[in-house]
């Protein structure tokens, strides 16, 4: 999906109002310095591409993020404010269903959510030069 035509300001507002709080809740009890940010993005469409991938695609050691509250609200925001997004997800979701059976918070998942927080922060500051 090409995120170029999304309403970035509305997605940002939804993130600041509620998604960010859900990410913090997920990470509660974890030190903010515990994980190094290794995933980066260069502009808002690129950030949303990386956020989508990290939120919804199962990875080794963390298959369950798509069932978390922040993921549900992220999906809602992308579907509402990115034209045609929900239609493109039909085939993609079917491929992921088997990997989503249980919700287990592993250290790998905590690291992945820490990366997500970094991507969202970068999304909110689009004019900053890439480090």
């Amino acid at each position: 999906y090409d995120f170029t035509n999304c309403d970035f300001e509305k997605i940002k507002a939804a993130y600041l109002s509620t998604i960010s709080k859900d990410l913090i809740t997920y990470m509660s009890g974890t030190k903010s310095t515990e994980f190094n940010n290794t995933v980066s993005c260069s502009n808002r469409p690129h950030c949303l591409t990386e956020i989508q991938s990290l939120t919804f695609n199962p990875t080794a050691g963390c298959a369950s993020l798509a069932k978390e509250m922040f993921a549900m609200k992220t999906k809602a925001a992308l579907a509402i404010w990115c034209p045609g997004y929900s239609e493109t997800q039909i085939n993609a979701t079917q491929a992921m269903k088997k990997a989503r059976k249980s919700k287990v918070t592993t250290n790998k998942c905590l690291e992945q959510v820490s990366q997500l927080q970094g991507l969202w922060r970068r999304f909110n500051r689009p004019l900053l030069k890439q480090q």
Epitope: K10, A13, A14, L16, S17, T18, K21, D22, I24, T25, A66, K67, M69, M72, K73, K75, A76, A77, A79, I80, Y85, S86, E87, Q89, I90, A92, T93, Q94
Partner: antibody, heavy 121, light 108 residues
């Protein structure tokens, strides 16, 4: 304007199944999660689960797992909630409620009129 | 699961008086995830207050919401006849979504 219109009242025998429908109009159906909430007579509200019409993804309340199935038909903008192995305690009004951002806060912003399901032998 | 406890179960108030409804949450949640709904007999619930303190469209200013963490409050500064109803709090912080048992505001 957003409207959620539910199917009519049902009377079922214990052990049977019931399928309630909720037809949506006035918004982009595929883009909003739909929730199902029930209310037993004289009781409070109980969340059963939700479905994302765009891809059919579901999140269920563990209390109903194995008994509840939520599906959707995008061609008619309708979501369905099927509850099986009915017992008398399932007698309730069943509501569909859209999940949406209001002032960028996420909540159930529109509700159907409710469907009364009576389970009686 | 997060347990929502509302008190009192029934509140008897005279028109023009102030009403305070409480919602206690079993574990701390963000204020953005606490909502209130109003329900009248034979009707569907209606969104009333979003995110602890934001009034839904068309809700009169005599209603207000406050709180944080585990304690939240809905206040009606001067009760009008149309305010007599049941009010439910609800959290959207973690699954399963849960509602309080409701507070019935009745005419004294």
């Amino acid at each position: 304007q957003v409207q959620l219109v539910q199917s009519g009242a049902e009377v079922k025998k214990p052990g049977a199944s019931v399928k309630v429908s909720c037809k949506a109009s006035g918004y982009a159906f595929s883009s909003y999660w739909m929730n199902w909430v029930r209310q037993a007579p004289g009781q409070g509200l109980e969340w059963m689960g939700q479905i994302f019409p765009g891809d059919g993804e579901t999140n269920y309340n563990g209390k109903f797992k194995g008994r509840v199935t939520m599906t959707r038909d995008t061609s008619t903008s309708t979501v369905y909630m099927e509850l099986s192995s009915l017992r008398s305690e399932d007698t309730a009004v069943y509501y569909c409620a859209r999940g949406g951002y209001v002032n960028f806060l996420y909540a159930m912003d529109y509700w159907g009129q409710g469907t009364t399901v009576t389970v009686s032998s | 699961e997060i347990v929502m406890t509302q008190s009192p179960a029934t509140l008897s108030v005279s028109p023009g008086e102030r009403a305070t409804l409480s919602c206690s949450v079993s574990s701390s949640i963000s204020s953005s995830n606490l909502h209130w709904y109003q329900q009248k007999p034979g009707q569907s619930p209606r969104p009333w207050i979003y995110g602890t303190s934001t009034l839904a469209s068309g809700i009169p200013a005599r209603f207000s919401g406050s709180g944080s963490g585990t304690e939240f409050t809905l206040t009606i500064s001067s009760l009008q006849s149309e305010d007599f109803a049941v009010y439910y709090c609800q959290q959207w912080s973690s699954y399963p979504l849960t509602f309080g048992g409701g507070t019935k505001v009745e005419i004294k």
